[in-house]
């Protein structure tokens, strides 16, 4: 695959140019119909590249993809903040990108795990993203499309904050969830997920090594490394907000 | 849609460097992702480099990455690509293309343009 160098701040008389898009819902709104890399520009943010996935529900913002463990996803806050990985393979957007997108609107959040077998599953929730004052707390704002999400995602109205093994945010007062586990991601108690997790080709005998994977634990559990994960956001309109 | 020009192309022998142009026409530029792809005699058509709307991000094929670099004025409604340390395996017709979404698989275009020739002596 093509290279792809990092993105500069272009220097250009913006009064003559079109605006970009601003994120992948309002790509879908102006006709456009297939998935993809394009290149958006949220508002106060420079223009990046983000994944674009079309549905029928729309357009969505792939913010997270996992399948093969080409990528070291144990790094610290800087490297979620800004963002990491191959925009045609595995990556992690980056909290900023993803702030900038939503703003202050409410969002849906889907995620979509597979097992070793071929299972899949498809999660949906109402989110709302906070800035990094508040460490990207992910505050669930509507229950949860599905069976699987009680106990996974704090209950509606509570916020959990990112953490990093070298920025502990995690509910927990006795352990640094990101340390003991491995990756970023909005720990809880340590044990309910966590989709930026070690990746495991083969299931390790022991379970200590086992815990640092990939897992849903209300889908195959607490100790099953899954195989493939995708996290996509879609901005709500702003009147959908509460 | 966009219109597109190649212009630049030449004989140039090893070692030196030539500056390719793309002009568009029609609105929007800035809005467009922009690709330069190669076709040698016998060989199936390849990607070079790409840029993105803004110029804010850059994409080079393996073989080309260090000696070639892409660029675009968004007012002038034109792309670049500055081609240097030119070898006789860089001698191709030369393509532009745009499109919305970042493509770097000729494949996935339809319709192509008459190109400019490059051609380098050894």
């Known amino acids: 695959l093509p290279e792809m160098a990092q993105p500069v701040d272009p220097a250009h008389n913006v009064s003559r140019l079109h605006r970009l898009p601003r994120d992948c819902q309002e790509l879908f709104q102006v006709g456009e119909r297939q998935s993809g890399l394009f290149e958006i520009q949220p508002q106060g943010s420079p223009p990046f590249l983000v994944n674009c996935k079309m549905t029928s529900d729309g357009g969505w913002t792939v913010i997270q993809r996992r399948h093969d463990g080409s990528v070291d996803f144990n790094r610290p806050w800087e490297a979620y903040k800004a963002g990491f990985g191959d925009p045609h393979g595995e990556f992690w957007l980056g909290l900023e990108k993803v702030h900038s997108i939503t703003g202050d609107r409410n969002s849906r959040l889907a995620v979509q795990l597979r097992d070793w077998d071929g299972n899949a599953e498809l999660l949906q929730f109402s989110v709302h993203l906070g800035g990094e004052d508040t460490a990207y707390s992910l505050q669930l704002t509507a229950p949860v499309a599905g069976q699987l999400g009680a106990t996974t995602v704090p209950p509606s109205g509570l916020s959990v904050p990112f953490s990093t093994w070298d920025q502990d945010h995690d509910l927990r007062r006795d352990k640094n969830c990101a340390k003991s586990l491995s990756g970023g991601w909005w720990f809880g108690t340590c044990s309910h997920s966590n989709l930026n997790g070690q990746y495991f080709r083969s299931i390790p005998q022991q379970r200590q090594k086992l815990k640092k994977g990939i897992f849903w634990k209300t889908w195959r559990g607490r100790y099953y490394p899954l195989q493939a994960t995708t996290m996509l956001i879609q901005p709500m309109a702003a009147e959908a907000a509460s | 849609e966009v219109q597109l020009v190649e212009s630049g192309g030449g004989l140039v022998q090893t070692g030196g460097s030539l500056r390719l142009s793309c002009a568009a026409s029609g609105r929007s530029f800035n809005l467009y992702y922009m690709g330069w792809f190669r076709q040698a005699p016998g060989r199936e058509r390849e990607f070079v480099a790409g840029i993105s709307g803004s110029g804010g991000s850059t994409f080079y094929g393996d073989s080309v990455k260090g000696r070639f670099t892409i660029s675009r004025d968004n007012l002038k409604n034109t792309m670049y690509l500055q081609m240097n340390s030119l070898k006789p395996e860089d001698t191709a017709v030369y393509y532009c293309?745009?499109?919305?979404?970042?493509?770097?698989?000729?494949?996935?275009?339809?319709?192509w343009g008459q190109g400019t020739q490059v051609t380098v002596s050894s």
């Open positions: 293309q745009s499109s919305r979404r970042i493509i770097t698989n000729p494949r996935e275009y339809g319709y």
